[in-house]
Structures are given as structure tokens and as C-alpha cells.
Interface confidence: low
């Protein structure tokens, strides 16, 4: 399927001009390659009429141009002074030859309709209203006024001043006069439909002295706006229907043969196919609203329509706006899994993609709520503090320049199941949707912290240990201190080479954190976690309370009297042959660890990925003088 997109059908009238926009995928090659417009002949050949290389055919000389807009990946063909000879099949495309990527466009140029010379033309959109002005001479002021619609043979009454109204115009047509002006009457017709288009005659008086005026009413379907979006990206339908429908229910529907199936409306209806990835947002009191859809799929391509009606459903004669959405499968947005699985008490690490060219953009994570019109309150962001109800169990790790940031949620409950969105304040196309599924845990968690009821005593030494299974052996372990601005990874030192995972003793794998001496600032949430290179895995959390020493409590001496370190982290292993430890002080990485791509660890992903990268894990210590090594046998 060609990734080039444009209008399928373009119509105009003789002497007018058209402007045809064609879209192409966002690549530098496409931005700079030749763009062309050619006419298809009976033989299948497509003859170039104009190209971005400067070629212009004789028949287009002086009346056409082609402009490339590389910044929004479109090019526009403008053609003026149209004649009926311009009717035909065309292609807009990219490439050095006319056999490159292209899109078929049908252009139809009609004759200007012949109307009586005094005809007044009114052009209105479907669903809107028209006020027809009917002047008359003063002597016809007392006479009957009327408006009729011309049919083949006769003129069928619409409305007259005796309050006679054609049944199909009841409630829609009004005949009135303004103020004291006795030389003009008006007919207003509301909720216009295609059937209302045609020739009308307004008349005041009877017989040869009657005043008559010819009126041509054209009722147009709105021209669909073209939207070109990448697979997995997001789209916003901005709907502006006008003040007259400000208080009506709003909807967005997708054309399906003859009907338009409602996808979402402001009365709470929502198509299950869009669950978790759609919001409808009223913009203001003027009838404006927008619908945002994330995680675009191939099957989302098509013809969309927004409208307003008290039923929240499409109704003939009510204003509409339309779009043609094209979903480009050559997407720049990486294919990540859209469902992440976790278990109660466990954790998930979610990789959120963003446009790598916007590494400095602010990153956010929000939870999609389906009630009402749908909304997505932000739970955490690079400059947004974690929401209170997620205290101690949610953090966002930003890796500038990489194109991925990571959100970790632990202490999972079944309440956490639902849809979440990754978004930034930059390129809105990169909004992505994740469905989090949480199953009841059927086994012990992979990471376990002891002691579980952690109360540290002020001024003393306090150690917590994080036990991990052998399958995490080759991965880095870390402790971090959680705050509502993130989880501050505690610096580490290299523990040196380790035993091979073949001889891993399931009962003795642990990484410990020592607070020495304990201070009041140490109180709070701490996480123990695993990661492989730039990929975060499981985490578990513990709250450490800090209390004053009560009488009778024993004073615990620090393991190393010279230790200046506030926190020492140790990798505890069975192999006592590891005697030489090289301590490496790592500069503080700031409030967020600079980690890159991440996959969720709630299902099998972790096991599939834990390959034997032995010797790469970091033990952790705040200063080079602190070494606490406990060997368990």
C-alpha cells in the first residue's frame, strides 16, 4: 500500500481554481525527493504536468505551480483557470519517475450552471440555516408574500404570509419582516439538507404586478479535511460546529457504507474498539470540542464525522464536520507491546517511547478514566510530583536522548488494572496507550526485603537486605530512595567478578543496604530493583521508619568504625574466593537514574532476557572507604 495520501475526488467549476494537497511519510529522503503531478492516459501511462524539479508542461504554463512543504511533509498543486478539459484521473507522487509512490486523484470540472440573470445564489453547509431576502415594491406591501421551490413543472409552496407551510419545512421555515421596512420580507430555513438545494422563487403580490425574485440555494457537504498520521501515533479531531449547537450533545462517528457509527459522544457512549485510547473534550461555550485517539491502528483509517444533536447520534439537517484519516504504516513510532501484565504485590516497568529529537521535552504518565467524556489525570511527570495515592510506589526514570523513558509502578493491586498513557509536552503524535493487567499472585514475589517491618533507630546502623532469585543473578541490583520527584539511585561500587550462575545458591542471593548512622532524613520509602544494562526490571518497596532510641535498647556498633558512608550497599554472594574488591565511587546521577530502554517484568520477559552477562553488576557504596561484606554459607 502506497504511503502517499491525498484527496480522492476534487471537484470545481470552469474558471475556478483548485489546490490539491498530497502527504508523504516523514523522512529526509522523502522531504527532498522529486514531487510530481501527472495525468493518467488510457494506456496507463502517466504524463508529467508539473514537478518539483521545475518542469512545467505547456498546458499548465502560467496557471499551475507545485510547492513542497518539507516541514509538514506535504506538497501542494495549485491549478487555476480550470476548463472541462481538465476533468480526468491524475496522480500525485514521489520519485525520480512517475512509477514511484503515488496516490490517485480524480478531478472533475463542471460547467457553470446557467441561471436566470437576476438569480441570487446562496451557498450554505449542511445543517446550517439560510435567510433569503425578498424585496418588493411598496404597492405590494398588503399582498400575500410567499416562497416556493421550483420542481420540473411547477413551483411548490414552502411558506407564505398566511402561515401556510409545506410539511417538509414545518419547524424549519419562518417568513418575517424586519422593523418598519415595508419593501423586503425574509424567509429563514434552518437545518438544511441536500434535499433543500435548488431553485426558489420569492413573490409578493399576484398577477403581472407581482414582485418576483429567483434564488439558487446550494447546500454543500463539508469538504473532508485530510489527516495523515503514523501507525501507533495519535490524532485529534478538532470540531467547531458553532454557537447554535453549543448546548447539544456532541459525537464523533466513522462512516460505514451508508451509516455513520458513533465512536464516542458526550452522553457516555463509546465504541469498545476505542476503550482506553479515546477522550472527548468540550473546548468552550461556542460548540467547539475535540476528540483525541491514541495508539492508532491500521483499521482506524477512514472517513470520520463530528456533529451535535440532543440524541448524541448523527441526524440529517444538523451541522457536521468531516475528516479523511490515513494511517501510514511506515511509522517512526516504535512497535512496543500495548499490554503489560503484572501480579498483585509485584511491579511493572513500562517503556514509554517519545520523539528522540525532543529529549528535553517533559514526560508524563496518566491514567485513562472512562467515566463521563473520558479524561487522563497525570500521575507522574518529569516536573510533576507523584500523586499522593501513589506515594512510595510510582516513579518516572528519564533517559535523555534515547527515545524512551521508564515508568515503574510497584505494590500492584487489582485496582491498578486499566489503561495508561505515555505523553510529552512535545510531539503529540507520540502519545501511546498501555493496558495494564493485574492478576492475583500465585507464588512468592521474586524480590523480598528483610526485615519487613523496618524501623531504624536514630544514630545507629541499620541494614536491610533484598533477596533475589538466581534468574536475576547476571543483572545489576540497585537500591534507590523514593521521593515524589523520583527514585534517587544510590551510588555503587564494583563488586568484581562473580561466581558462575551455574553454582547459584537460591537461598543466599541478596543485596544489602546499610544506613550508618541513621538520621531523621533517612525515613521514607526505599526500592530494591534489578536492571539489565539500560533496561529496568522488577522492583519491591519498603518503608523505613526512624525512631529515637528508647531506654534499654542496645547500641549497635558500625561494622567499620572509620566508615564515613551514609549508605553502604553490598552484593552478598556465596563464593568466598571473591576477596579483592575494587571500590569505585560513582558520581551522583541526580534525581533520576539515566537508564534507557525498558521492558515490563510481569510475565516471562525477564526470564527470556536474563542472559549470562556475569561480572557486570555493580555492588554499591557511598564512599570508597566503606566495605561491608557478609558472606553466607
Amino acid at each position: 500500500k502506497s504511503p502517499i495520501f491525498g484527496p480522492q475526488e476534487v471537484s470545481s467549476i470552469e474558471g475556478d481554481s483548485v489546490s490539491i494537497t498530497c502527504y508523504y511519510p516523514d523522512t529526509s529522503v522523502n522531504r527532498h525527493t522529486r514531487k510530481y503531478w501527472c495525468r493518467q492516459g488510457a494506456s496507463g501511462m502517466c504524463t508529467t504536468l508539473i514537478s518539483s524539479n521545475g518542469y512545467l508542461s505547456k498546458e499548465y504554463s502560467g496557471r499551475a505551480n507545485l510547492i513542497n512543504f518539507p516541514e509538514n511533509n506535504t506538497f501542494v498543486i495549485n491549478i487555476e483557470q480550470l476548463t472541462q478539459d481538465d476533468t480526468g484521473s491524475y496522480k500525485c507522487g514521489l520519485g525520480t519517475s512517475n512509477r514511484g509512490l503515488s496516490f490517485d486523484v480524480s478531478l472533475e470540472v463542471s460547467q457553470v450552471p446557467e441561471l436566470p440573470s437576476d438569480t441570487h445564489v446562496y451557498t450554505k453547509d449542511i445543517g446550517r440555516n439560510v435567510t433569503i431576502e425578498c424585496p418588493f415594491k411598496r404597492e405590494n406591501a398588503p399582498s400575500k408574500k410567499s416562497l416556493c421551490k421550483k420542481t420540473n413543472q411547477s413551483c411548490e409552496l414552502v411558506i407564505d404570509s398566511t402561515e401556510k407551510v409545506n410539511p417538509s419545512y414545518i419547524g424549519r421555515a419562518k417568513l418575517f419582516m424586519k422593523g418598519t421596512d415595508l419593501t423586503v420580507f425574509y424567509v429563514n430555513i434552518s437545518h438544511l439538507t441536500h434535499n433543500d438545494a435548488g431553485l426558489y422563487i420569492c413573490q409578493a403580490g399576484e398577477g403581472p404586478s407581482a414582485d418576483k425574485k429567483n434564488v439558487d440555494l446550494q447546500v454543500l457537504a463539508p469538504e473532508p479535511e485530510l489527516l495523515y498520521k503514523d501507525l501507533r501515533s495519535s490524532v485529534t479531531f478538532e470540531c467547531d460546529l458553532g454557537r447554535e449547537v453549543a448546548n447539544e450533545a456532541k459525537y464523533l462517528c466513522r462512516m460505514n457504507k451508508e451509516t455513520c457509527d458513533v465512536i464516542i459522544n458526550t452522553l457516555g457512549k463509546r465504541d469498545p474498539d476505542f476503550e482506553g485510547r479515546i477522550l472527548i473534550t468540550p473546548k468552550d461555550d461556542n460548540g467547539r470540542f475535540s476528540v483525541l485517539i491514541t495508539g492508532l491502528r491500521k483499521e482506524d483509517a477512514g472517513h470520520y464525522q463530528c456533529g451535535a444533536h440532543s440524541s448524541g447520534l448523527p441526524q440529517e439537517g444538523w451541522p457536521i464536520q468531516t475528516w479523511q484519516l490515513f494511517v501510514n504504516e511506515e511509522s517512526t513510532i516504535p512497535n512496543r507491546r500495548s499490554v503489560v501484565k503484572g501480579v498483585t504485590g509485584g511491579s511493572v516497568a513500562i517503556a514509554c517511547p517519545y520523539n528522540p529529537k525532543e529529549s528535553s521535552s517533559l514526560k508524563y504518565w496518566c491514567r485513562w478514566e472512562g467515566d463521563g467524556n473520558g479524561h487522563c489525570p497525570v500521575l507522574v511527570g518529569t516536573q510533576a510530583q507523584v500523586q499522593e495515592e501513589y506515594e512510595g510506589r510510582l516513579a518516572l526514570f528519564d533517559q535523555p536522548g534515547n527515545g524512551t523513558y521508564t515508568v515503574i509502578l510497584n505494590q500492584l493491586t487489582t485496582e491498578d488494572a486499566g489503561f495508561y498513557w505515555c505523553l510529552t509536552n512535545g510531539d503529540s503524535r507520540w502519545r501511546t496507550t498501555i493496558e495494564l493487567q493485574v492478576a492475583e499472585a500465585t507464588r512468592e514475589p521474586n524480590l523480598e526485603v528483610t526485615p519487613q517491618n523496618a524501623t531504624a533507630v536514630l544514630g545507629e546502623t541499620f541494614t536491610v537486605s533484598c533477596h533475589y532469585p538466581c534468574k536475576f543473578y547476571s543483572q545489576e541490583k540497585y537500591w534507590c530512595k523514593w521521593s515524589n520527584k523520583g527514585c534517587h539511585i544510590l551510588p555503587s561500587h564494583d563488586e568484581g567478578a562473580r561466581q558462575s550462575s551455574v553454582s547459584c545458591d537460591q537461598s543466599s542471593q541478596l543485596v544489602s543496604m546499610t544506613l550508618n548512622p541513621v538520621s531523621k532524613e533517612d525515613e521514607g520509602w526505599y526500592w530494591c530493583g534489578v536492571k539489565q544494562g539500560q533496561t529496568y526490571g522488577e522492583t519491591t518497596a519498603i518503608y523505613i521508619a526512624v525512631e529515637e532510641r528508647t531506654r534499654g535498647s542496645s547500641h549497635v556498633n558500625p561494622t567499620d568504625a572509620n566508615a564515613r558512608a551514609k549508605v553502604a550497599l553490598e552484593e552478598e554472594v556465596v563464593d568466598s574466593s571473591i576477596s579483592e574488591k575494587e571500590n569505585k565511587a560513582i558520581p551522583n546521577p541526580g534525581p533520576f537514574a539515566n537508564e534507557r530502554e525498558i521492558q515490563n517484568v510481569g510475565d516471562q520477559a525477564q526470564e527470556n532476557r536474563a542472559s549470562g552477562d556475569a561480572g557486570s553488576a555493580d555492588g554499591q557504596s557511598r564512599s570508597s572507604s566503606s566495605k561491608h561484606h557478609h558472606h553466607h554459607h
Partner: nanobody, 121 residues
Framework: EVQLVESGGGLVQPGGQLRLSCAAS????????MAWYRQAPGKQRGLVAI???????HYADSVKGRFTISRDNAKNTVYLQMNSLEPEDTAAYYC???????????????WGRGTLVTVSS
């Protein structure tokens, strides 16, 4: 809001040179493409040069080899060095930038008010 302010236009003789500057200011979160367009009297506005999001540059055929576009990302500023100017280069030069603001997700096109370049002897 975002403002783009062009400067550096003026009257110059054929064969001469000028350097245009355009600075973007306001509540800017991120700037993607920055470009120069021009519009000669009675003609449509056309692309002169673009400094694309990936750092690539692109020039209209008529200015290749004579004009150079450059950019200072830290200052959100784009420059157009115009050498060997010809009378056909006479036009209003407009700066264009795709900008994401702090308060609105997504990029939008912003335009400057233009600076006039006249090449005449």
C-alpha cells in the same frame, strides 16, 4: 505565546551580501524545523531554505550555492547568509519555525512579520 523576529534586511547592490537573523522567543519547550521563505511582489510565498529537525539543510534550486542557512539551537535562532545577491532575490523574507510551547502539546507553525531585502543598483 511565541514570537519570531527577523532582522538584517535592507538595500544591497547586485553581487552584494546580507545576513538575516530570526530569533524565536516566548514559552518555548522545543523547536523542530526552522526555515526561511520569501515572497516577491505579486508572487506566492516560496521556500528558500530549511534547517530540518535532524540537522539536514535543504535549499531552493534558485539559491543553491549562494545562500547558507545555519542555526543556534541554544538561542532558538536561525540565520540566512545571502551571497552573490541578484535582483531576482528582491522579496520580503519570512522566518518560519515549528514550535512546541510549554502549555500546549504538539508542534505548531509560527511565522515572523518579515524583513524586506531589495537588490538594486
Amino acid at each position: 505565546e511565541v514570537q519570531l523576529v527577523e532582522s538584517g534586511g535592507g538595500l544591497v547592490q547586485p553581487g552584494g551580501q546580507l545576513r538575516l537573523s530570526c530569533a524565536a522567543s516566548g514559552s518555548i519547550a522545543s523547536v523542530r524545523d526552522m526555515a526561511w521563505y520569501r515572497q516577491a511582489p505579486g508572487k506566492q510565498r516560496g521556500l528558500v531554505a530549511i534547517f530540518a529537525r535532524g540537522g539536514t539543510t535543504h535549499y531552493a534550486d534558485s539559491v543553491k550555492g549562494r545562500f547558507t542557512i545555519s542555526r543556534d539551537n541554544a538561542k532558538n535562532t536561525v540565520y540566512l547568509q545571502m551571497n552573490s545577491l541578484e535582483p531576482e532575490d528582491t522579496a520580503a523574507y519570512y522566518c518560519n519555525a515549528e514550535v512546541a510551547t510549554m502549555f500546549q502539546p504538539g508542534f505548531r507553525d509560527y511565522w515572523g512579520r518579515g524583513t524586506l531585502v531589495t537588490v538594486s543598483s
